[in-house]
Amino acid sequence: KKVVLGKKGDTVELTCTASQKKSIQFHWKNSNQIKILGNQGSFLTKGPSKLNDRADSRRSLWDQGNFPLIIKNLKIEDSDTYICEVEDQKEEVQLLVFGLTANSDTHLLQGQSLTLTLESPPGSSPSVQCRSPRGKNIQGGKTLSVSQLELQDSGTWTCTVLQNQKKVEFKIDIVVLAFQKASSIVYKKEGEQVEFSFPLAFTVEKLTGSGELWWQAERASSSKSWITFDLKNKEVSVKRVTQDPKLQMGKKLPLHLTLPQALPQYAGSGNLTLALEAKTGKLHQEVNLVVMRATQLQKNLTCEVWGPTSPKLMLSLKLENKEAKVSKREKAVWVLNPEAGMWQCLLSDSGQVLLESNIKVLPTWSTPVQP
């Protein structure tokens, strides 16, 4: 008996060939011996089987002695033995229809679990192997689970169902809903305008939800909600914003926030959460602000940074084109009695400058100038 594997929702063509290369009488029946279709001369006739509306043949092939049974929009319950009766012969074809579906939705939040469920006909014992877009292989029976979805899991999952040494391949597009970056850090000199951007790692037709930016300033004892907003069909509208700082928000995606000026009291870290409509859970992106200030008070030149800096970052004070006068893994450095000239305050990581602030030290009779 020939075995054919089909996919739920697809179309399958079961072949039946006569030795005579001409149009002769044929019938396709199901295992209950109920007629599905056949011919009456050059006419296609259909019996009362459940396939009635979804069964067809190719009349153009009848003259060549080929009498296929085409079943459209396959269902698991179409799995059956189909019998073609032609020239006093019976050809049997066993059709096994499988379906592979993702749990509830193919759009999942980062960190959530993906469960793929195999629908199979009774009596079958298929094995399933799936390959994720990042090349990870998972195997299983009726269900396959992947916990803690990552951004790299977005894309086409290719799953192969194996039964009776035959295989059928399913492709499922999974979208992991996440921000492009889990965390970002912005380095600014005091007084500069700050731009925070929160690009999404996915695109969907309509995006609706609501979000909020909570901020924990380094100097503050508790966190504070800086802004709340709504998202409707990719249009952003601000619901509530604090008076200090008075953030501004872009009306279109990607989510974009502007802080008019970087001040030491704003330095710290924030957490932007986005709750999407019809989704349980939220998207998160951490954002950090580091603010630098260089000042000269009497005979003391000071450079300070506020905000979440790593212990390996180096803060230096140097006269332009000279070696660093002071360089420490601390958040404040100073030079007493600095000589006149353009001084540079540098925040660097392994020699790479992250933030730079220049201050001009005038001869002792003058007041300092900040460019």
Partner: antibody, heavy 120, light 107 residues
């Protein structure tokens, strides 16, 4: 066991739509085909069509342009609508279950029938 | 559509008689034929399926045979409760069609 009960108005005006409902009790409406058959007084049986929860309905070509069948699984009911009726549509209307099993296809359970008269 | 023609359209017989009704299909329907019995004011009842198989609970005096286009239905020994109208029905091809019926009356 499965029982069927037709319901609907006994009198319908010409050109209007005849609406009948068949309630299935003692079993699920899923999985089977459910059909409507009619019988004008003193005449033979005419198959109107059939419907299944998971498939498209099949209608008798002679009535296809006027017939609509639907299923309400939550109420375990299926219904028939026949539009633009004339006196020729006056008949006893039966609902029945079409059962398929090995070497078997038949209407094994019937409702008791409901008389519909088309008259102004 | 497949036309089903029944002979005779009516017949009179007595209790104990052997009665045969014939049904002819306008084209080959293999053995896809059922026989129904209908009593006045009642719904039809399936007696024979697949041309010759007796539905469960139906007395063995009822039988059917035939294949292709010609079919017969026989009651071997008429009982008083058998007087009714009998219909053949094909299910080879949709639409399902019935014969015009044979009315069996008491002589």
């Amino acid at each position: 066991q499965v029982q069927l009960q037709e319901s609907g108005p006994g009198l319908v005006k010409p050109s209007e739509t005849l609406s009948l409902t068949c309630t299935v009790s003692g079993g699920s409406i899923s999985r089977y085909y459910w059909s409507w058959i009619r019988q004008p007084a003193g005449k033979g049986l005419e198959w109107i069509g059939r419907i299944c929860t998971s498939e498209n309905p099949n209608y008798n070509p002679a009535l296809k342009s006027r017939v609509t069948m639907s299923v309400d699984t939550s109420k375990n009911q299926f219904s028939l609508k026949l539009s633009s009726v004339t006196a020729a549509d006056t008949a006893v209307y039966y609902c029945a279950r079409e059962l398929e099993r090995l070497n078997y296809y038949g209407m094994d359970v019937w409702g008791q029938g409901t008389t519909v008269t088309v008259s102004s | 559509d497949i036309q089903m023609t029944q002979f005779p359209s009516s017949l009179s017989a007595s209790v104990g008689d052997r009665v045969t009704i014939t049904c002819q299909a306008s084209q080959d329907i293999s053995n896809y034929l059922n026989w129904y019995q209908q009593k006045p004011g009642k719904a039809p009842k399936l007696l024979i399926y697949d041309a010759s198989n007796l539905e469960s609970g139906v007395p063995s005096r009822f039988s059917g045979r035939g294949s292709g286009t010609d079919f017969t239905f026989t009651i071997s020994s008429l009982q008083p409760e058998d007087f009714a109208t009998f219909y053949c029905q094909q299910y080879d091809t949709l639409p399902i069609t019935f014969g015009q019926g044979t009315r069996l009356e008491i002589k």
